[in-house]
Interface confidence: medium
């Protein structure tokens, strides 16, 4: 999901170019300071160099660009705009570069950009138009196919006075630019909920990773439109139960594999439908590993081994009999 290339493809020697011939323009295959370049692999790596800005003198041939482990802080509009444009750039990895602000149009003028990884950056301010480039109600389609946004939640004291989930979703939905997105990774972001409209507007999704968040419920989330969805990662959340509507929608997706490990399933009367569904469905990977977390008497029981007699609810006491 992020640009890779083998280290052996990087040339270990380079010409010294000490020619006294008539003046020429700068060499097209020059490598920016603090970077490693392989024209054969069309790859530039500027990794762990404490760069504070994107190098301006990137070679035009670059197809895979790694800018990981730096101190970029801000990606301004047109951060990668060059003349001539970086027309070949297809995979851009900016993970772990201390970005806290990505401005509108940061990725404009990258006509071939298919993979973008912004993971492990504390994005306190992600512009709604970071990926769409404009505030038009319908923008030009983005070429992005993979968007990796794992662990982009900033520390609590750096968050703006607004919903982090809302900020991320606004950027995903602006201008309907990401209609072609096939992979979206949003793991480890402390998401408490998934805004209901987000998935409906990303109809091309094949892979969705929401693992290691704090999702309590999927009641208001619709998967119905995601007819191409192949994998849905919901491991390590706070899910208590999946209700009938969600179960039916997941069952109706032709290619889906769902991952549900390490959720605190509540094995009471509300779990009956899910247990029945689990016993019949093929869509849940590792379903034999799912265990109850609550109530205490059910802890560590395997969901697939439960029957309806196990799944009871304490009777609701009338108000006059309730204690404080």
């Amino acid at each position: 999901s992020s640009p890779t290339s083998s280290a052996s493809s990087f040339s270990s020697s380079a010409p010294f170019l000490a020619s006294a011939v008539s003046a020429q323009p700068p060499l097209p295959d020059q490598c920016p300071a603090l970077c490693e370049c392989s024209e054969a692999a069309r790859t530039v790596k500027c990794v762990n160099r404490n760069l504070t800005e994107v190098p301006t003198d990137l070679p035009a041939y670059v197809r895979n660009l790694f800018l990981t482990g730096n101190q970029l802080a801000v990606l301004p509009a047109g951060a990668f705009a060059r003349r001539p444009p970086l027309a070949e750039l297809a995979a851009l990895n900016l993970s772990g570069s201390r970005l806290d602000e990505v401005r509108a149009g940061a990725f404009e003028h990258l006509p071939s950009l298919r993979q973008l990884d912004l993971s492990h950056n504390p994005l306190a301010d992600l512009s709604p138009f970071a990926f769409s480039g404009s505030n038009a109600s319908v923008s030009a389609p983005s070429p992005l196919v993979e968007l990796i946004l794992n662990h982009i939640v900033p520390p609590e004291d750096e968050r703006q006075n607004r919903s982090f989930e809302g900020m991320v979703v606004a950027a995903l939905l602006a201008g309907r630019a990401l209609q072609g997105l096939r992979r979206l990774e949003l793991a480890s972001n402390h998401f408490l909920y998934l805004p209901r409209d987000v998935l409906a507007q990303l109809p091309s999704l094949r892979h969705l990773d929401l693992s290691n968040n704090s999702l309590v419920s999927l009641t208001y989330v619709s998967f119905r439109n995601l007819t191409h969805l192949e994998s849905l990662h919901l491991e390590d959340n706070a899910l208590k139960v999946l209700h009938n509507g969600t179960l039916a929608e997941l069952q109706g997706l032709p290619h889906i594999r769902v991952f549900l490990d390490n959720n605190p399933w509540v094995c009471d009367c509300h779990m009956a439908d899910m247990v029945t569904w689990l016993k019949e469905t093929e869509v849940v990977q590792g379903k034999d590993r799912l265990t109850c977390a609550y109530p205490e008497k059910m802890r560590n029981r395997v969901l697939l081994e439960l029957n309806s007699a196990d799944l009871d609810c304490d009777p609701i006491l009338p108000p006059s009999l309730q204690t404080s």
């Epitope: 003046a23 020429q24 323009p25 700068p26 060499l27 300071a33 490693e36 404490n50 760069l51």
Partner: antibody, heavy 120, light 111 residues
Framework: EVQLVESGGGVVQPGRSLRLSCAAS????????MHWVRQAPGKGLEWVAY????????YYADSVKGRFTISRDNSKNTLYLQMNSLRAEDTAVYFC?????????????WGQGTTVTVSS | DIVLTQTPLSLSVTPGQPASISCRAS??????????MHWYQQKPGQPPQLLIK???NLESGVPDRFSGSGSGTDFTLKISRVEAEDVGVYYC?????????FGGGTKVEIK
């Protein structure tokens, strides 16, 4: 033969300005990043500033940031260092040096240096 | 900033004998592919001259009695048989990140 010749050094009072030049010959100047490095009397080497081949990228040492400006004129094959708000601790021999196209290769050619003395 | 620590500070060598200078970086200056450490010789009254680039690559025109090795944080410059003309100060320098820094230098003298 690659040659780098610095000029413009001299004695200057604290707070004043000076502009150093480095004339390059024997190679295609516009293809190479260039650096300034200095050496205080009896001391070691200190990197000062860098400019990319097409003047699109600049880097500075913290000790000179905001006071010194590196520039170049590829049509004249010349590198410059504009030094403002000079301090006594800027007293040094200033060398210009060439970076190969691939930066993992160190500074392959150096000028003889020009001496800057900041004193009241 | 990356600090480069050179040892020893000075070295007195008999002609024909080997010499070794160490340079230790406060953090790694190597990628999986390359090392961004270089060695220079500076003779009295002259500018530095590049001897070894990228840890172990001999600069053209430099005698092959000079060699370099190392990766990560530990690097070594070796002179297999010291000659009288090798007197001077030797510096290591990294180009891993900004600012580039130099070691404090090692002074080589002839006994």
């Amino acid at each position: 033969e690659v040659q780098l010749v610095e000029s413009g050094g001299g004695v200057v009072q604290p707070g004043r300005s000076l502009r150093l030049s480095c004339a390059a010959s024997g190679f295609t100047f516009s293809n190479f990043g260039m650096h300034w490095v200095r050496q205080a009397p009896g001391k070691g080497l200190e990197w000062v500033a860098y400019i990319s081949s097409g003047s699109s990228t600049f880097y500075y040492a913290d000790s000179v940031k905001g006071r010194f400006t590196i520039s170049r004129d590829n049509s004249k094959n010349t590198l410059y260092l504009q030094m403002n708000s000079l301090r006594a601790e800027d007293t040094a021999v200033y060398f210009c040096a060439r970076s190969p196209a691939y930066y993992r290769y160190g500074l392959d050619y150096w000028g003889q240096g020009t001496t800057v003395t900041v004193s009241s | 900033d990356i600090v480069l620590t050179q040892t020893p500070l000075s070295l007195s060598v008999t002609p024909g004998q080997p010499a070794s200078i160490s340079c230790r970086a406060s953090q790694s200056v190597s990628s999986s592919t390359f090392s961004y450490m270089h060695w220079y010789q500076q003779k009295p009254g002259q500018p530095p001259q590049l001897l070894i680039k990228s840890s172990s690559n001999l600069e053209s025109g430099v005698p092959d009695r000079f060699s370099g090795s190392g990766s990560g944080t530990d690097f070594t410059l070796k002179i297999s048989r010291v000659e009288a003309e090798d007197v001077g100060v030797y510096y290591c320098q990294h180009s891993w990140e900004i600012p580039y820094t130099f070691g404090g230098g090692t002074k080589v003298e002839i006994k």
